[in-house]
């Protein structure tokens, strides 16, 4: 099953997976000035059998200028905020990770791909965190998060990582010897109180009805 929400955000840190469980989807996103080909794949899907897993579908991008029915609008400055998704990086898969049965490796890049990859993960997926450049990792426990199913809802475990503003970066697993870290607080696996809040889409009616979910502003 797909995880309903996204992996936790850790200040000054990014996450990535070493391998992707079957069922994982990768959005076919294109860089600015390009778009998916008409009726092209919306996402790649990690599929497979007991012996081999691979990515189904191919992402293809074409110049936005070739489709005159597409209205392309330059976003406002506030819309150019950096996306908090996994940054696309060169594949660095330890063989024992990417060769796991039922897992796919990092897909190769496609032409005119967006600079960041957006994955939709499935239950059981593990992602690893590292501090961004210029920040140092203080571990209270594992710097990883797992999507789990609890009481019919999906949730991500909380990575025990703090990134402090010192010029030393931590590494993803397999890149260098793991740092020793003090024991982290174990998460409860039984209490329903630990489940994450359901995601919401809601708004308020401007100054009139607090219970309405959409703000309507008359011009």
């Amino acid at each position: 099953e797909l995880c309903d929400d996204d992996p936790p955000e850790i200040p000054h840190a990014t996450f990535k997976a070493m391998a992707y469980k079957e069922g994982t989807m990768l959005n076919c996103e294109c860089k600015r000035g390009f778009r998916r080909i008409k009726s092209g794949s919306l996402y790649m899907l990690c599929t497979g059998n007991s012996s081999h897993s691979s990515w189904d579908n191919q992402c293809q991008c074409t110049s936005s200028a070739t489709r005159n029915t597409t209205k392309q609008v330059t976003p406002q400055p506030e819309e150019q905020k950096e996306r908090k998704t996994t940054e696309m990086q060169s594949p660095m898969q330890p063989v024992d990770q990417a060769s796991l049965p039922g897992h796919c490796r990092e897909p190769p890049p496609w032409e005119n791909e967006a600079t960041e990859r957006i994955y939709h993960f499935v239950v059981g997926q593990m992602v690893y965190y590292q501090c961004v450049q210029g920040y140092r990792a203080l571990h209270r426990g594992p710097a990883e998060s797992v999507c789990k199913m609890t009481h019919g809802k999906t949730r991500w475990t909380q990575p025990q990582l703090i990134c402090t503003g010192e010029m030393e970066t931590s590494q993803f697993p397999g890149e260098e010897k793991p740092q020793a870290s003090p024991e982290g607080r174990p998460e409860s696996e039984t209490s329903c109180l630990v489940t994450t809040t359901d995601f919401q889409i809601q708004t308020e009616m401007a100054a009139t009805m607090e219970t309405s979910i959409f703000t309507t502003e008359y011009q």
Partner: antibody
């Protein structure tokens, strides 16, 4: 008819800036109709033909908000308008919706 | 095109809803939603056959190409609602809906 209205949708609980977002409407007693969608960074916007040139979709990722500016409103625009997150090729979750009535 | 427009059944019965596309639905980009009066649609099935999180296993989706079905194996009282299919080609499109009502 002919008036303007701006709808706002505030999202929480997911990484808003990582998803395409859509507006879907439903006329009273009728089925669902997709209206418009917008890419994560706002650089691509698409509309159903019937609202092209009159409606504008936009977003503010800093505020986790999605907007629909509706101009030159017509009676046939009367509907419940839902905002929804696009995930893969489907919509989930959906907002609760707001009724827009265009009448003289 | 969704058929039938209305399905009159009793609790415990099996419901089979049909969705037929005018063109082949690429990559099984087809979803099913349930909508109850005064509520927003709720995702049931995505990718033609995958159940969304928290959806009971009495709901199942099937099909490929142009013909898709949603099956409710044993209707529960809370299942009586309107069901929509939705495809994603160059843009999203919804079927006209099937109302499942109590006989």
């Amino acid at each position: 008819p002919g008036g303007s209205l701006r709808l706002s949708c505030a999202a929480s609980g997911f990484t808003f800036s990582s998803y395409w977002m859509s507006w879907v409407r439903q006329a009273p007693g009728k089925g669902l109709e997709w209206v418009a969608n917008i890419k994560q960074d706002g650089s691509e916007k698409y509309y159903v033909d019937s609202v092209g040139g009159r409606f504008t979709i936009s977003r503010d990722n800093a505020k986790n908000s999605l907007y629909l500016q509706m101009n030159s409103l017509r009676a046939e625009d009367t509907a419940v308008y839902y905002c929804a997150r696009e995930k893969g090729s489907w919509f989930d979750p959906w907002g609760q919706g707001t009724l827009v009535t265009v009448s003289s | 095109t969704q058929s039938p427009g209305t399905l009159s059944l009793s609790p415990g019965e099996r419901a089979t809803l049909s969705c037929r596309a005018s063109q082949s639905v690429s990559n099984n980009y087809l979803a099913w939603y349930q909508q109850k009066p005064g509520q927003a649609p709720r995702l049931l099935i995505y990718g033609a056959s995958s159940r969304a999180t928290g959806i009971p296993d009495r709901f199942s989706g099937n099909g490929s190409g142009t013909d898709f079905t949603l099956t409710i194996s044993r209707l529960e009282p809370e299942d009586f609602a309107v069901y929509y299919c939705q495809r994603y080609g160059s843009s999203p499109r919804f079927g006209g809906g099937t109302k499942v009502e109590i006989k």
